[in-house]
Interface confidence: medium
Amino acid sequence: SGTTNTVAAYNLTWKSTNFKTILEWEPKPVNQVYTVQISTKSGDWKSKCFYTTDTECDLTDEIVKDVKQTYLARVFSYPAGNVESTGSAGEPLYENSPEFTPYLETNLGQPTIQSFEQVGTKVNVTVEDERTLVRRNNTFLSLRDVFGKDLIYTLYYWKSSSSGKKTAKTNTNEFLIDVDKGENYCFSVQAVIPSRTVNRKSTDSPVECMGQEKGEFRE
């Protein structure tokens, strides 16, 4: 139970892609404001988004400090004009989020095919190593930096003239595939972390086809 003026936040939800991580909740405030706190299981609580009327809080700066930790957040509700006011138990009304482990749960963003190059009957397809918001030493780390060999890519490729798809996998950012000479092919890639139980796959990249700008052809 809280003060008569405030209601507890509910539907606390983590929204995270490539470690860009936002906590969302309801309801839209009416005569109340929110403050968010975040902590690891063994750490101290850190306050963020002080006395906000938003129903989301960007917690990226906190979770990127150690993406393998498990985090818990809580959202406090205060009367809009009296943030010192507390609930009947002598503390502000609050609600806990589900636990969130970025390394295991952040969504994999849509990958991009950086380039493809044909040499005879081989095509080398390169996936862009997308930068995340995880930062170390003035370096925005790439997905590969963070996930290492946990991250693989699946390539889907097919002749422009047909719909039958083939697949290839790599634990680097490059594929080398065999193609039929004189045929144009289209490509799409997907990022995958096979060891995960949730959010295992990204959405497919935009399709890129031979004969368009990104490719290069050499005899």
């Epitope: 930790q69 190593d129 930068r131 995880v134 170390r136 030493n137 925005f140 780390l141 930096d145 680097t172």
Partner: antibody, heavy 121, light 106 residues
Framework: EVQLVESGGGLVQPGGSLRLSCAAS????????MSWVRQAPGKGLEWVGF??????????EYAASVKGRFTISRDNSKNSLYLQMNTLRTEDTAVYYC????????????WGQGTLVTVSS | AIQMTQSPSSLSASVGERVTITCRAS??????LNWYQHKPGKGPKLLIY???TLQTGVPSRFSGSGSGTDFTFTVSNLQPEDIATYYC????????FGQGTKLEIK
């Protein structure tokens, strides 16, 4: 299997120059940050510098003790890392190691066997 | 540049004992501190990262704590295979190793 093999060490006079090489194999070289670490005789480890990966445009950083004198570069077509050392001082005498650097937790996860550089007149 | 002061430079302890090594940074480094174990003829091995997170496969007798400028590394039940030199490494701003602590068994 990941392998790093350094070469190019030797005896050089103070004020002289030397270029160390590190041949890498067993991993996609362009995806990794690479570093040089040294250990003077009877002393501890000292980080020398690193060169970032393709996603970070192969930019470099150096320890204050070598900045302006040492240059790290890489030839990705040869899977090779280099350390160009100029204006060498006696205090640069050390075994120089190349190491693969996983930046997210600052882990040097693979090391070469090292090459000895002796700066002496 | 950030300086790391590690102490003691050497220590001797008996099997089963608890040993502690400290590292002090010349400025606030948040919790961006690692502990490495270095055995002769081998590459240094990461034991603990981000002050207190145990690297996969590292025995739980190793632990770390601290934040800001003062950090502690503890081996709670010393084993013969723990003989090595231990280094702290800050990675908040570039990379700096501590001077190292040589751990010996009595």
């Amino acid at each position: 299997e990941v392998q790093l093999v350094e070469s190019g060490g030797g005896l050089v006079q103070p004020g002289g120059s030397l270029r160390l090489s590190c041949a890498a194999s067993g991993f996609t070289f362009t995806e990794y940050h690479m570093s040089w670490v040294r250990q003077a005789p009877g002393k501890g480890l000292e980080w020398v510098g690193f060169i970032r990966n393709r996603a970070n445009a192969y930019t470099t950083e150096y320890a204050a003790s070598v900045k302006g004198r040492f240059t790290i570069s890489r030839d990705n077509s040869k899977n090779s890392l280099y350390l160009q050392m100029n204006t060498l001082r006696t205090e640069d005498t050390a075994v120089y190691y190349c190491a693969r650097l996983t930046m997210v937790v600052a882990e040097f996860d693979y090391w070469g066997q090292g090459t000895l550089v002796t700066v002496s007149s | 540049a950030i300086q790391m002061t590690q102490s003691p430079s050497s220590l001797s302890a008996s099997v089963g004992e608890r040993v502690t090594i400290t590292c002090r940074a010349s400025q606030d480094i948040n919790k961006y501190l690692n502990w490495y174990q270095h055995k002769p003829g081998k590459g240094p091995k990461l034991l603990i990262y981000y002050t207190s997170t145990l690297q996969t496969g590292v025995p739980s007798r190793f632990s770390g704590s601290g934040s800001g400028t003062d950090f502690t590394f503890t081996v709670s039940n010393l084993q013969p295979e723990d003989i090595a030199t231990y280094y702290c490494l800050q990675y908040d701003n570039l990379l700096t190793f501590g001077q190292g602590t040589k751990l010996e068994i009595k």
